[in-house]
Amino acid sequence: IWELKKDVYVVELDWYPDAPGEMVVLTCDTPEEDGITWTLDQSSEVLGSGKTLTIQVKEFGDAGQYTCHKGGEVLSHSLLLLHKKEDGIWSTDILKDQKEPKNKTFLRCEAKNYSGRFTCWWLTTISTDLTFSVKSSRGSSDPQGVTCGAATLSAERVRGDNKEYEYSVECQEDSACPAAEESLPIEVMVDAVHKLKYENYTSSFFIRDIIKPDPPKNLQLKPLKNSRQVEVSWEYPDTWSTPHSYFSLTFCVQVQGKSKREKKDRVFTDKTSATVICRKNASISVRAQDRYYSSSWSEWASVPCS
Amino acid sequence: RAVPGGSSPAWTQCQQLSQKLCTLAWSAHPLVGHMDLREEGDEETTNDVPHIQCGDGCDPQGLRDNSQFCLQRIHQGLIFYEKLLGSDIFTGEPSLLPDSPVGQLHASLLGLSQLLQPEGHHWETQQIPSLSPSQPWQRLLLRFKILRSLQAFVAVAARVFAHGAATLSP
């Protein structure tokens, strides 16, 4: 058993049929010694008396808010949550496996630049009685500070018969050094509580590996005289790290016909312009990627040819 | 051509070669074995590689003030990785495939380090750790980790030379 926060405790249980469970001793936070009784949740049934209560925690029915009273007055509370371990593996019932980039990916994180700011998100099908708490650091043995905000519900989607809820959180490294080569990964830890079930999820990454620039901005076409060719130009996204002579991007320009089956013409360039042939009803799209490190491409910025 | 006693490096040449290094490091990476080695042996096998850290002056401001500190750091790293790529980790069993870019990568690391330090001008270099894996799986894992680490190192070096070529070239 360990303390998650004041008056909230997590009991770690090996979860299998007829498991013995864990013996837990609760102590009433009071100077009083006599006439103390204990109840669980809203029930008025007295579970025991005395300053301490010893219980055997085996299942969710044994978890909940234990309250000690004296003469009708509440003295203190202890909320017990359960953390299940099945076959030596902690349960992951609350969050959905996003399966990208690999199986057992529950948290996904992205950064728009090298400033030390990043966003993580996760998915669940649970709509109520759900709380999240996020902590982060750079490195684990001698951790350096990363400050995370509160996790918020950022999207709701319907997937078949189910509703899916996306939560996200923004974090900022306290003393970020955008130009340095990271040697210690960022660690992100999410505590998830659904009703009386506790679970924790972790992710470890370098900012360089989660970089995904915003799409190029101000995408424009300039027809070239007496030609089917056009000059496409664009600019670095505002959110990208500066100076651009140091934090350079590379770009992919694509000409795509109306039909997805039509052959795509692609050009790669380090410049912020390119000359391409504009076909009727086609569109021109441009996306960006760090020039020197193959992290994710941005989403496409697009304009119609006509 | 290089930086003896604090003169400027051939920024544009260094930029071109460092960008080539980035491409080679990424093309070599999947070919050293296979991709899913991350879970195997979480112990840090490449702890001793030289990293370009915050105080090394490789940021735009540091380069403007005095690029020597940063260039020395980059040179140390290039020599270190060049030695690793020529070591038993990469030459031992299992042999690399005939079309592996590791050989080109090795030569390019040497080429860039020579651009930075001509004959007769010596910066101290970091000792290469005595990593001598005895089993094939250990070698494959080390190759994977070294190339991952090299990718990050050459990305910073390439940024430095690109910025230098754009803003510090005579």
């Epitope: - | 074995g33 296979h34 195997e40 030459t91 031992g92 069993e93 299992p94 042999s95 495939l97 005939p98 005895s134 089993q135 094939p136 799986w137 494959l140």
Partner: antibody, heavy 115, light 107 residues
């Protein structure tokens, strides 16, 4: 085209030694380790060891230490395996092979040990 | 040493059949496993590396799967020319060791 040409069959008496060769062509000889594999008649394959032609350093299967000696001649791009104190147990086909990923094998040298 | 055990020792099949050959390692070798085919009076030929990665020039009917200590070589539609002995090999640790082989025959 990569080729590994092995020396011809050997018939030797018990207690004798034999040295078989594997001439490589079609690639840079020093770039890849050369392995040796034993296959007794109707049996499976046994890895004897390999030699790094660049530095001449061998790595043996413990079982064949003292039995096999691997050497190379860089100038002729040839690898050699010497087997000593031969017994009937050593009768087998011996293959030289470039490392597993490269998958090039010699045609095999048949060794018969008989009095 | 890592012991590689193959089963069955012999497999008799009809052309067009899908067959599975099994290989078990005495300890986990992750996916450092190679499969070879050896036809009569020929040298072995590599079919699969790293348990499931195909080799150029090898027909697509050959595929490999497994990780840890249990591995399978599948031939999804056996051809008469597939007769021979199939060996698995540990590529994880020295000494490299081979399985005893599975002999594939056509009925």
């Amino acid at each position: 085209e990569v080729q590994l040409q092995q020396s011809g069959p050997e018939l030797v008496k018990p207690g004798a030694s034999v040295k078989m060769s594997c001439k490589a062509s079609g690639y840079t000889f020093t770039a890849y380790n050369m392995h040796w594999v034993k296959q007794s008649h109707g049996k499976s394959l046994e890895w004897i060891g390999y030699i790094n032609p660049n530095n001449g350093i061998p790595n043996y299967n413990q079982k064949f230490k003292g039995k096999a000696t691997l050497t190379v001649n860089k100038s002729s791009s040839t690898a050699y395996m010497e087997l000593r104190s031969l017994t009937s147990e050593d009768s087998a086909v011996f293959y030289c092979a470039l490392n597993w990923d490269l998958d090039y094998w010699g045609q095999g040298t048949t060794l018969s040990v008989s009095s | 040493d890592i012991v590689m055990t193959q089963s069955p020792a012999t497999l008799s099949v009809t052309p067009g059949d899908r067959v599975s050959l099994s290989c078990r390692a005495s300890q986990s070798i992750r996916d450092y496993l190679y499969w070879y085919q050896q036809k009569s009076h020929e040298s072995p030929r590599l079919l699969i590396k790293f348990a499931s990665q195909s080799i150029s020039g090898i027909p697509s009917r050959f595929s490999g799967s497994g990780s840890g200590s249990d591995f399978t070589l599948s031939i999804n539609s056996v051809e008469p020319e597939d007769v021979g002995v199939y060996y698995c090999q540990n590529g994880h640790s020295f000494p490299y060791t081979f399985g005893g082989g599975t002999k594939l025959e056509i009925k």
